[in-house]
């Protein structure tokens, strides 16, 4: 069986301040079992943007019903975008365990923020 891939189709996304940003992410397999997390940045200091399992993410909603067992679309929408939200966002698949371990990352989507249209 082919190994799971994490696909972030958009290399970059540009959004006007105040609008919502949709960041696309799909996986190609249901195996291994485990959650998806979204991060801004790479490396040790990356910021957690969304965790499928738990957490407080008031500006983030999932585009599809990510809790459904057969779901393979883990795209998210971030509301009320400001210039402080600019950065590269990564969709990361984890393998279930204690603790969950990182399995594979998408290539990243760079979010840039345009000035609010007057």
């Amino acid at each position: 069986e082919e190994e799971l891939q994490v696909i972030q189709p958009d290399k970059s996304v540009s959004v006007a301040a105040g609008e919502s940003a949709i960041l696309h992410c799909t996986v190609t397999s249901l195996i291994p079992v485990g959650p998806i997390q979204w991060f801004r940045g790479a490396g040790p200091a990356r910021e957690l943007i969304y965790n499928q399992k738990e957490g407080h993410f008031p500006r983030v909603t999932t585009v599809s019903e990510s809790t459904k067992r057969e779901n393979m679309d883990f795209s998210i929408s971030i509301s009320n975008i400001t210039p402080a939200d600019a950065g590269t966002y990564y969709c990361v698949k984890f393998r279930k365990g204690s603790p969950d371990t990182e399995f594979k990352s998408g290539a990243g989507t760079e979010l840039s923020v345009r000035a609010k249209p007057s």
């Epitope: 040790p44 990356r46 407080h56």
Partner: antibody, heavy 117, light 108 residues
């Protein structure tokens, strides 16, 4: 307002242990990496250790194998377990919130650790 | 490990004057350099990151620039509250995160 409050510093003898705590508030603790930075009396800043949002830990060579960083997300608290303390570990220890840019945007006021016989 | 060398060690400036000091990296860090201000008995405060981006709430009199591996922090017109020690820090993606030795800006 973001607040970081360190505690647990004090005077210990060489070879002894100490555990520092850093209570965080004003931000979603689980979403950010956090770090310890120290400053010996009259000296500059030295990065000590960092723990990522997923719990991966990183250490300066000078403390590797002696210090252990950990976090309790349910308590929004960062810890630094310091074993085998040496005179050269004497410093003010600061905890700081780390941005995704790898910079330290909020700092606590620090707690003084003195290692002396 | 990336070594950061700050110069001068001490800078004597009169209030209202311009202050400029530098930080040189031993190897390339791109634009990943930050500046912090520390006053006696206080914690450091983030001023600048990515070589020239001011942190939230930092006045426009503070500016940063880069030329290769040499970075400069400029305070256009020194206020009394600006007399402090200034540290640079490289913030490339992976530890160890290193700091320069500091530049003390004192009243002339």
């Amino acid at each position: 307002d973001v607040q970081l409050v360190e505690s647990g510093g004090g005077l210990v003898r060489p070879g002894e242990s100490l555990r520092l705590s850093c209570a965080a508030s004003g931000f979603t603790f689980t979403n950010y990496a956090v770090t310890w930075v120290r400053q010996a009396p009259g000296e500059g800043l030295e990065w000590v250790s960092l723990i990522s949002v997923t719990g991966t830990t990183y250490y300066a060579d000078s403390v590797k194998g002696r210090f252990t960083i950990s976090r309790d997300n349910s308590k929004s608290t960062l810890y630094l377990q310091m074993n085998g303390l040496r005179a050269e570990d004497t410093a003010v220890y600061y905890c700081a919130k780390v941005t995704w840019k790898n910079v330290f945007d909020y700092w606590g006021l620090g707690t003084l650790v003195t290692v002396s016989s | 490990e990336i070594v950061l060398t700050q110069s001068p060690g001490t800078l004597s400036v009169s209030p209202g004057e311009r202050a400029t000091f530098s930080c040189r990296a031993s190897q390339t860090v791109g634009s990943k350099l930050a500046w912090y201000q520390q006053k006696p008995g206080q914690a450091p405060r983030l001023l600048i990151y990515d070589a020239n981006t001011r942190a939230t709430g930092i006045p426009a009199r503070f500016s940063g620039s880069r030329s290769g591996t040499e970075f400069t922090l400029t305070i256009s017109s020194l206020q009394s509250e600006d007399f402090a020690v200034y540290y640079c820090q490289q913030h490339t993606d992976w530890p160890p995160y290193t700091f320069g030795g500091g530049t003390k800006v004192e009243i002339k």
